[in-house]
Interface confidence: medium
């Protein structure tokens, strides 16, 4: 049976970083994923690329070069994305989602010509196509409304970190998080910690079997799962203690909702 394939650095202000974590060394963590990330290098005073293993590490790690520069370089102002001339969207806005060949896990945005909106998808880190934006705002400016730039969108919405139906996953089923609304469990909006603690357990793409722990935002506990050694996401810890230390602190006590701390 034959199957058909779908078509598919800036000037520095002060030398003192804006945040103490910007002075931390790049930490790839103990996991074996290969995720292209960025860190602020205190010695060169620039944001540089490094490979992140997919779990643990430290706060001097950013998904995009832009995010790194904005966070760690004093006086860095985001250069405005030039809108396309006239009301025409560039041709690449109409390209279908292409996660790319590589096995990274990068949050990106694409223009969906069916819904006429910019949506989140997961990019593997190489190849793919040009319908691929580092920020929702950039996607909107170029593809949704190329003439009238919309007001900036706050990117760090908790829903952005939850795998949704538009995300291409590395398995055939899309792994949605369903958070039960019983009075004993925290809802997503009651969580103010690290956003990856809301991601589902992801065993990854390889063939190893390693004991790992993930934080379950519905139960407020860290549970065991088997990790295959590469890929997956940041909700992946080598010990239950590290998992709890990283994610449990985000729970907010709320008497009316009975959230367990």
């Amino acid at each position: 049976l034959s199957e058909e394939a779908d078509d598919t650095d800036s000037e520095l202000g002060s030398m003192k970083p804006l945040h103490t974590f910007c002075a931390m060394k790049a930490d790839d963590g103990p996991c074996k994923a290969m995720i292209r990330s960025y860190f602020f290098n205190m010695y060169t005073h620039q944001c540089e690329e490094f490979i992140y293993g997919g779990c643990e590490g430290n706060e001097n790690r950013f998904d995009t070069l832009e995010e790194c520069k904005k966070t760690c370089i004093p006086g860095y102002e985001k250069t405005a994305v030039k809108a396309a001339s006239g009301a025409e969207r560039p041709d690449f806005c109409f390209l279908e989602e292409d996660p790319g060949l590589c096995r990274g896990y990068m949050k990106r945005y694409l223009y969906n010509n069916q819904t006429k909106q910019c949506e989140r998808f997961v990019y593997g880190g190489c190849l793919g196509n040009r319908n691929n934006f580092e920020t929702l705002d950039e996607c909107k400016k170029i593809c949704e409304n190329p003439v009238h730039s919309p007001s900036p969108v706050n990117e760090v919405q908790m829903s952005d970190y939850v795998t949704d139906g538009n995300t291409v996953t590395d398995r055939s089923t899309v792994n949605n998080i369903v958070v039960p609304q019983s009075p004993k469990v925290p809802r997503r909006r009651d969580y103010r910690g690290r956003p990856w603690c809301l991601q589902p357990a992801d065993s990854g793409l390889c063939k190893a079997s390693e004991r790992r722990f993930y934080y379950n935002s519905a139960t407020g506990k860290c549970h065991r799962f088997n990790y295959t050694g590469c890929g997956g996401n940041n909700n992946n810890f080598t010990t239950r203690r590290r998992c709890l230390r990283s994610c449990k602190t985000g729970l907010i006590k709320n008497k009316s909702k009975g959230v367990v701390k």
């Epitope: 199957e3 058909e4 394939a5 779908d6 078509d7 598919t8 290969m34 292209r36 690329e49 490979i51 292409d98 996660p99 060949l101 590589c102 096995r103 593997g124 880190g125 190489c126 190849l127 793919g128 196509n129 291409v168 996953t169 590395d170 398995r171 055939s172 899309v174 793409l205």
Partner: antibody
């Protein structure tokens, strides 16, 4: 050890369709994290990447602009192989055609033996 | 498209000498996605280096790769008779993947 075995005619007439097949052993055409592609080499052009297919949650392909309107690369999961079709060929398409496995992080680590395709009447 | 320019076009050296091959990209390429290949007449290319500096399985330690951004280098520390061949760089960072035009290393 991944091995790729190419098959297909070495002579194609102008305006006809060039068809080549690449049989895979030691891996699966549906494997996650690898792409299966075609590259050609002619004295005038050097190595030219034509395109590839790969599977994540569904099949994806990517083609070079120079051949995009004429090329199709398809997987055949039942035979664990993939094929190249290049329509409306001209003598400019005369080249040695290679199939290759592109690893997601590791380059083209396995190649077919190459097939010299001559476009001539 | 990212254009990769290799230099020199031909390198004439003797066995035992050090070979330094250059690959320059028209725009920045992630070092994770740059590879080097060796090709001998009548044969398919053979992967030598991936991720700009990682040796592929079975590749001798005399081959090393380095570089970042737009400038990448393949070094053969001491040429053996079997190393005389044509070498290509390839980027697989962005679509379309592209190759350099090649550097031929010939016996002086």
């Amino acid at each position: 050890q991944v091995q790729l075995q190419q098959s297909g005619p070495g002579l194609v007439k102008p305006s006809q369709t060039l068809s080549l097949t690449c049989a895979i052993s030691g891996d699966s055409v549906s494997s996650n994290g690898a792409a299966w592609g075609w590259i050609r080499q002619s004295p005038g052009r050097g190595l030219e990447w034509l395109g590839f297919i790969y599977r994540r949650s569904k099949w994806y392909n990517s083609y070079a602009v120079s051949v995009k309107s004429r090329i199709t690369i398809n997987p055949d999961t039942s035979k664990n192989q993939f094929s190249l079709q290049l329509n409306s060929v001209t003598p400019e398409d005369t080249a040695v055609y290679y199939c290759a496995r592109q690893d997601g992080m590791g380059g083209m680590d396995s190649w077919g033996q190459g097939t010299l395709v001559t476009v001539s009447s | 498209d990212i254009v990769l320019t290799q230099s020199p076009a031909t390198l004439s050296l003797s066995p035992g000498e050090r070979a330094t091959l250059s690959c320059r990209a028209s725009q920045s390429v992630s070092s994770f996605y740059l590879a080097w290949y060796q090709q001998k007449p009548g044969q398919a290319p053979r992967l030598l280096i991936y991720g700009s500096s990682s040796r592929a399985t079975g590749v001798p330690a005399r081959f090393s790769g380095s570089g970042s951004g737009t400038d990448f280098t393949l070094t053969i520390s001491s040429l053996e008779p079997e190393d005389f061949a044509t070498y290509y760089c390839q980027q697989y960072d962005s679509t379309p993947s592209t190759f350099g035009q090649g550097t031929k290393v010939e016996i002086k």
